[in-house]
């Protein structure tokens, strides 16, 4: 009956962690004697190829300084106790502790048997490192040029993490990769870039990080912060301002980041009706008169700049009853 070596084609281990490389001789055959078990690294330099051996009488040996006896152990293989029992070598599973990047590669598990001869199996050990992820908004100011408004960083992954962004904005990503502080790892930085405008401020975008060590992608929301000058509009005019009306109000509506620091009401004619009183973002009209036949301007300032809006007012002699009732702002 033929025997075979059962190994996994690929085993993954976490950097710094412990991994087991399974190796079994199958099937159990009466009279098949396993005289030696060895683990080798065929792709390593000559003096590092022999990783471990298990001799039925001598037990385990770990000759190579890499990985070295302090980091290697046979999981199940048992030495013969005295000379009365046979060594149990059918399970030659090898454990590697404190995994390093240098441990990655091909490992050959070999059983020297009698009378079948030598049989072997090969496993590829991949050393992976789970990256640490963070994402943050960059405080930027309104500009005409593309600017990085958010960063997503996946630190010290192996292999490098894949970063993408989920957003409805008009954007592009710029990625850089640098070596991590842990040997063999990579830190990936993705820059979410757009032309920063008020439309992007407060919008939440999502950084998506994919890595084979994750069961599912990491999704990190980031709320953008764009400093921009006030975007102003005026509300409250209902096209039914008539002489003597007393309940009219204009409101200066603003979107800005940061908050407005000042409101200024004026008219294009230069004449400001005395019955109009500016109260911050509101202009309260005590009584409409003919001087209101003008264009009102609201100018708003913040730390970034200023914005303005105009509202043309037409004063009627009598109320317009055809339309809806007055809305006094």
């Amino acid at each position: 009956q033929d025997v075979r070596v059962q190994v996994l084609p690929e085993v993954r281990g976490q950097l710094g962690g412990t991994v087991e490389l399974p190796c079994h001789l199958l099937p159990p055959v009466p009279g098949l004697y396993i005289s030696l078990v060895t683990w080798q690294r065929p792709d390593a330099p000559a003096n590092h190829q022999n990783v471990a051996a298990f001799h039925p009488k001598m037990g385990p040996s770990f000759p190579s300084p890499k990985p070295g006896s302090e980091r290697l152990s046979f999981v199940s293989a048992k030495q013969s106790t005295g000379q009365d029992t046979e060594a149990e070598l059918q399970d030659a599973t090898l454990a590697l502790h404190g995994l390093t990047v240098e441990d990655e590669g091909n490992y050959t598990c070999e059983f020297a048997t009698f009378p079948k001869g030598s049989v072997r199996g090969m496993t590829w050990l991949r050393v992976i490192a789970k990256p640490k992820n963070q994402a943050e908004a960059q405080k930027v100011t309104f500009s005409q040029d593309p600017t990085t408004v958010a960063l997503c960083i996946s630190k010290e992954g192996r292999p490098p993490a894949r970063i993408s962004w989920l957003s409805s904005l008009d954007w592009e990503a710029k990625e850089t990769q640098v070596s991590g502080t842990l040997a063999g790892t990579v830190t990936v930085t993705s820059r979410f870039t757009l032309v920063p405008s008020g439309r992007a401020d407060g919008v939440t975008v999502t950084c998506k990080v994919e890595h084979e060590s994750f069961e599912e992608p990491a999704l990190i929301p980031v709320t953008l912060s764009v400093r921009y000058p006030p975007e102003v509009s005026i509300s409250g005019y209902d096209d039914n301002w008539y002489l003597g009306r007393t309940d009219a109000t204009l409101s200066c509506d603003v979107r800005s980041n940061p908050e407005p620091t000042g409101y200024d009401w004026s008219t294009t004619s230069g004449t400001f009706p005395t019955s109009a009183v500016a109260q911050g973002s509101q202009l309260v009209i005590h009584a409409v008169d003919s001087l209101f036949n003008t264009t009102f301007v609201c100018t708003v300032t913040n730390a970034v700049g200023m914005g303005r809006a105009e509202q043309v007012i037409f004063v009627r002699e009598t109320p317009n009853t055809a339309g809806a009732g007055a809305t006094g702002g």
């Epitope: 060895t38 009488k57 009698f114």
Partner: antibody, heavy 116, light 107 residues
């Protein structure tokens, strides 16, 4: 302590047979193959074959298959190697040996001289 | 059968010398090679197994190296008690085969 004790020296005529014994002690006889290796005077080592006392399975070097018979008697923990149709070039020291990783335990050797 | 060609057949060296014995297999045997020492009138004793692993109790002046088809036994500093014959053996494939031996003489 593992011991393999072989039978004494033999002088044989060409064409005859010789049967060498190897009595084992100090371990479970049925769990290990017993191998036979010979060494002609001033020459190298040559593997003849082996027997597994657990099920009397045997395995031979093709060169000796027609002339060698290797057996084991579990009741006495003794292995035997019989070589027939002897010729002068069969003159050698014959060893029984136990494979524990390598040929780790050896009998003291039995000198077989084939001479007319 | 795999042929193990050992050289030299005879070696004469002085105490303290570094000496090497080589063994060439007729086909790839991986690292499945043993080196034995046989003193006059005694059965062989294991020195090295799996090409480079030193057996229990063997002085560290004995080292083995090689894989595939080429193997070397090195004695780094020859001692008078090393007077013996040395054999390589492959156990990769049945039948086991031995080298023809190297007789080491102390000058």
């Amino acid at each position: 302590e593992v011991q393999l004790v072989q039978s004494g020296a033999e002088v044989k005529k060409p064409g005859s047979s010789v049967k060498v014994s190897c009595k084992a002690s100090g371990y479970i006889f049925t769990s290990y193959w017993i191998h036979w290796v010979r060494q002609p005077p001033g020459k190298g080592l040559e593997w003849i074959g082996a027997v597994y006392p657990g099920n009397s399975d045997s395995n031979y070097n093709q060169k000796f298959k027609a002339r060698a018979t290797i057996t084991a008697v579990t009741s006495t923990s003794t292995a035997y190697m019989e070589l027939s149709s002897l010729r002068s070039e069969d003159t050698a020291v014959y060893y029984c040996t136990k494979l524990v990783g390598t040929f780790d335990y050896w009998g003291q050797g039995t000198t077989v001289t084939v001479s007319s | 059968d795999i042929v193990m060609t050992q050289s030299p057949s005879f070696l004469s060296a002085s105490v303290g010398d570094r000496v090497s014995v080589t063994c060439k297999a007729s086909q790839n045997v991986g690292i499945n090679v043993v080196w034995y020492q046989q003193r006059a009138g005694q059965p062989p004793k294991t020195l090295i197994y799996s090409a480079s692993y030193r057996y229990s109790g063997v002085p560290d002046r004995f080292t083995g190296s090689g894989s595939g088809t080429d193997f070397t036994l090195t004695i780094s500093s020859l001692q008078s008690e090393d007077l013996a014959e040395y054999f390589c053996q492959q156990y990769n494939t049945n039948p086991f085969t031995f080298g023809q031996g190297t007789k080491l003489e102390i000058k």
